[in-house]
């Protein structure tokens, strides 16, 4: 039975040209995390494999930095980066847990962070 929950940074906003950290945390399970995939709608941004470390998709090599931890740092943000981001935890023996983050990239200098929330 899948007992874990994923806590994410929820709905967040950031300034155009700036950077943002996407973070998820898996709790309430003893399952072993074998890999975490970071995806943006229909694109893969990065993979963190428990044994090998990070893989960054070629399209994002100039703008994505691994970490902190299992998180992902997006740099040089554009308005096109606005949208849904998913952290997909591959675990054994539980299976797959998915967390969702919505990022809004703002033209203005006011960019507030939203509240944290959980996805079972």
């Amino acid at each position: 039975m899948m007992t874990g929950t994923i806590e994410t940074t929820g709905n967040i906003s950031a300034e155009k040209g700036g950077s943002i950290i996407l973070q998820c945390h898996l709790s309430s399970t003893t399952a072993q995390v074998t890999q975490v995939n970071w995806e943006q709608q229909d694109q893969l941004l990065a993979i963190c494999n428990a044994d090998l470390g990070w893989h960054i998709s070629p399209s994002f090599k100039d703008r994505v930095a691994p970490g902190p931890g299992l998180g992902l740092t997006l740099q040089s943000l554009t308005v096109n980066d606005t949208g849904e981001y998913f952290c997909i935890y591959h675990t054994y023996p539980d299976g797959t847990y998915t967390g969702r983050i919505f990022l809004e990239v703002l033209e203005s200098s006011v960019a507030e962070h939203g509240a944290r929330f959980q996805i079972p």
Epitope: Q35, N37, E39, D42, Q43, L44, I47, N49, D51, L52, G53, W54, H55, I56, S57, P58, K61, D62, R63, V64, A65, P66, G67, T73, Q75, H90
Partner: antibody, heavy 127, light 106 residues
């Protein structure tokens, strides 16, 4: 040009250990990621495991209890040991390089594909 | 495990033909796919990464396309030296390979 060459016995008895060596020229095994892949009769291929630039390892879960990959950086070689072999382990064994990339954060990241391979060595498990 | 299925298993074509090889993943792998060429008795040769990016030094008659679950390797004008077995490999979740497509001359 990066070149890899596998070597080791072509015949191993059931229940014994299979030991293979991959000798690398044109690249240091202290960089990039180095893997073993095998092709069974009938063409099915299986990734077996990696040793990384730092010496850490990653193994196919289906082989985890039987496999060991080590290296000797002074000889620029890495090694495969597969224990308790059966006739199902009869295959052509190849070593290969998976290249790495240095990220913005100066971390080494794996690329996922194998850009240089050895020609492979056929290993038969039979009594 | 993600399963990779290649079709056809055998393809016969003439020199100059446009040849299309298919690779299907059992679930979405985005574009994390590589293609290789292997001639009899030789080491595999790396052709394409990230589904459509040509490795340096590979002739431009080779091209890759696709994303998600369906991928294609195209040889735009088959040459005698292209006779080989071609296989795909995913690197989205672990590393798994297709069964290969053997290309021969008619």
């Amino acid at each position: 040009e990066v070149q890899l060459q596998e070597s080791g016995p072509g015949l191993v008895k059931p229940s014994q250990s299979l030991s293979l060596t991959c000798s690398v020229t044109g690249s240091s095994i202290a960089s990039d990621y180095w893997g073993w892949i095998r092709k069974f009769p009938g063409n099915k291929m299986e990734w077996m495991g990696f040793i990384t630039y730092s010496g850490s390892t990653s193994y196919n879960p289906s082989l985890k209890s039987r496999i060991s990959i080590t290296r000797d950086t002074s000889k620029n070689q890495f090694f495969l040991q597969l224990h308790s072999v059966t006739t199902d382990d009869t295959a052509t064994y190849s070593c290969a390089r998976m290249p790495s990339f240095i990220t913005l954060a100066s971390l080494s990241t794996w690329e996922g594909y194998f850009d240089f391979w050895g020609p492979g060595t056929m290993v038969t498990v039979s009594s | 495990d993600i399963q990779m299925t290649q079709s056809p298993s055998l393809l016969s074509a003439s020199v100059g033909d446009r040849v299309t090889l298919n690779c299907k993943a059992s679930q979405s792998i985005h574009k994390n796919l590589a293609w290789y060429q292997q001639k009899l008795g030789e080491a595999p040769k790396f052709l394409i990464y990230y589904a459509n990016s040509l490795q340096t030094g590979i002739p431009s008659r080779f091209s890759g396309s696709g994303s998600g679950t369906d991928f294609t390797l195209t040889i735009s004008g088959l040459q005698p030296e292209d006779v080989a077995t071609y296989f795909c490999q995913q690197y989205y979740s672990g590393w798994t390979f297709g069964g290969g497509t053997k290309v021969e001359l008619k």
